[in-house]
Amino acid sequence: AGVFELQIHSFGPGPGPGAPRSPCSARLPCRLFFRVCLKPGLSEEAAESPCALGAALSARGPVYTEQPGAPAPDLPLPDGLLQVPFRDAWPGTFSFIIETWREELGDQIGGPAWSLLARVAGRRRLAAGGPWARDIQRAGAWELRFSYRARCEPPAVGTACTRLCRPRSAPSRCGPGLRPCAPLEDECEAPLVCRAGCSPEHGFCEQPGECRCLEGWTGPLCTVPVSTSSCLSPRGPSSATTGCLVPGPGPCDGNPCANGGSCSETPRSFECTCPRGFYGLRCEVSGVTCADGPCFNGGLCVGGADPDSAYICHCPPGFQGSNCEKRVDRCSLQPCRNGGLCLDLGHALRCRCRAGFAGPRCEHDLDDCAGRACANGGTCVEGGGAHRCSCALGFGGRDCRERADPCAARPCAHGGRCYAHFSGLVCACAPGYMGARCEFPVHPDGASALPAAPPGLRPGDPQRYL
């Protein structure tokens, strides 16, 4: 057991241009408060699990009123640490979410209004008992500076708070095989006491009172060898004589969820779905009002001005649950078509489409001329895994939307001058050349390289390229 401690040093505009507007004004004075959410392991910040390691809410900071014309300074902060107690071992790696909330103190109907100013998240490695770690995180134009540490609560010690300490029985040294408890040199490390009867050969424990089995052994005391050959089912006959796998107590046995919460098993543990008014890992936190900021993940709290009246969390897209603590797996809907890959960005769902497809759900076949007209009289040509537009004269671009300059490619050879014309281009050829693009030299004897000059056309006449 132990406590995670968070000290906020400052919250204010970050460096660089685009300083944020002050969140408070003379008309709407406000004050800040913070919420921290901790999850074990290097999970995604917005993973399905709620704040499984715990969450804490700071006190309200001093009331702040913006000075007109002054830039937003570092805002006044609440006093004291945010403390998140943990009952079990400290995991060593953890994810955090720190939210900065604004409480507006103007003439609000129904009491003060809360809004989320900034939200930072990260993943860190941290040994319990170590020094304070400093951190700076940015959220938009805001910057949050803070320190954190994990410390064990006596008698626990160690980087995971799993070793226990006891006062020395002898004044000079600890018992056989036991070390002094740093930093409490006058105490000794206590031997870890497993569950009574736990097999010394096939069982072990990481916490006092537990009995965990080595591979191949099962049963509450790890005395039953596992043999699946004669079992009737995976959770087969639970008798030691058959040597079958005996399911240990399920994580939801005895319902660990308090206050009417319902328990569901997860791959590693259990999860409590709490009734409104309660939250926490086991629904043990109660008497909650909107003032306690019970809505996670930027949910908006409505009602619940006193502990007896219910509050309602209006969840942002992608979250659900009475406290917006559960992430909705929206990609499980499989909205992306034509082999598109679904990405849940939190605020939005995005489909990454395979080549040749487009649209919010990859529903649009770009190779299909039927669904992709070309503008300005262009015609659609399929092929090569993509459609393309063959544009009418005077137009260009992917969809024939751009007015083309027919002279841009300098089509007139041998110094001919190009003129744009409604039906295309016209080349005025330099003396001695003729042809639609002035490509044919006129021979000195008046004959040309052409088999026959078009009737009525003298060499040097402008040639229209149609």
């Epitope: 897209p317 929206r330 809907l333 499989q334 909205p335 992306c336 078509r337 679904c342 960005l345 605020h347 939005a348 769902l349 995005r350 489909c351 487009a358 649209g359 919010p360 759900r361 529903e363 649009h364 669904g371």
Partner: antibody
Amino acid sequence: EVQLQQSGAELVRPGALVKLSCKASGFNFKDYYIHWVKQRPELGLEWIGWIDPENGNAIYDPKFQDKASITADTSSNTAYLHLSSLTSEGTAVYYCASEDAYYPFAYWGQGTLVTVSA
Amino acid sequence: DIVMSQSPSSLAVSVGEKVTMRCKSSQSLLYSSNQKNYLAWYQQKPGQSPKLLIYWASTRESGVPDRFTGSGSGTDFTLTISSVKAEDLAVYFCQQYYSYRTFGGGTKLEIK
């Protein structure tokens, strides 16, 4: 707060071109498709087309293919609708709306009235 | 193009009554891979922009009262208001987002 703020009303001559804007705020512009919808009195809602601001790809209803062009500027989080060769039939309210893969048109602009008159 | 037809084009009901309006598409909006219907319902009150009510044919948008229910599959869809309130005065549009986007002509709900 998610918002789509559209430009003000326009009075244009027949045959002219008009450019309407739709400025997004409160969300990541590149993660949503922006659609344009036309509404004439008693004629309901007509879809014009969409743009993906992430790559500039635009798709149109064929009947608006020659009349409309949609662009987006990610630096200002703004989508544009260019309407050309306007006739009296172009008189309408034009809305922009945002869509992701989960929600269809979840957020709408307030609309821009375009009046085509000599 | 997928054509969307709505019926009736208008109806007048008293407060507290149940209302049903229909939407029919010219081709199926059910995508077989996820068994979802790519259909939405919108409410447009006088002088306002449309507002999303229902998506995926039956999923109610956050904040929409539970008196609004969407149902149906394939080509036939229904929007039901279980007990009409005065503030429900509006035009209701269905929209397909299966291919391109097309809207129905709308059903105008008037209060007697």
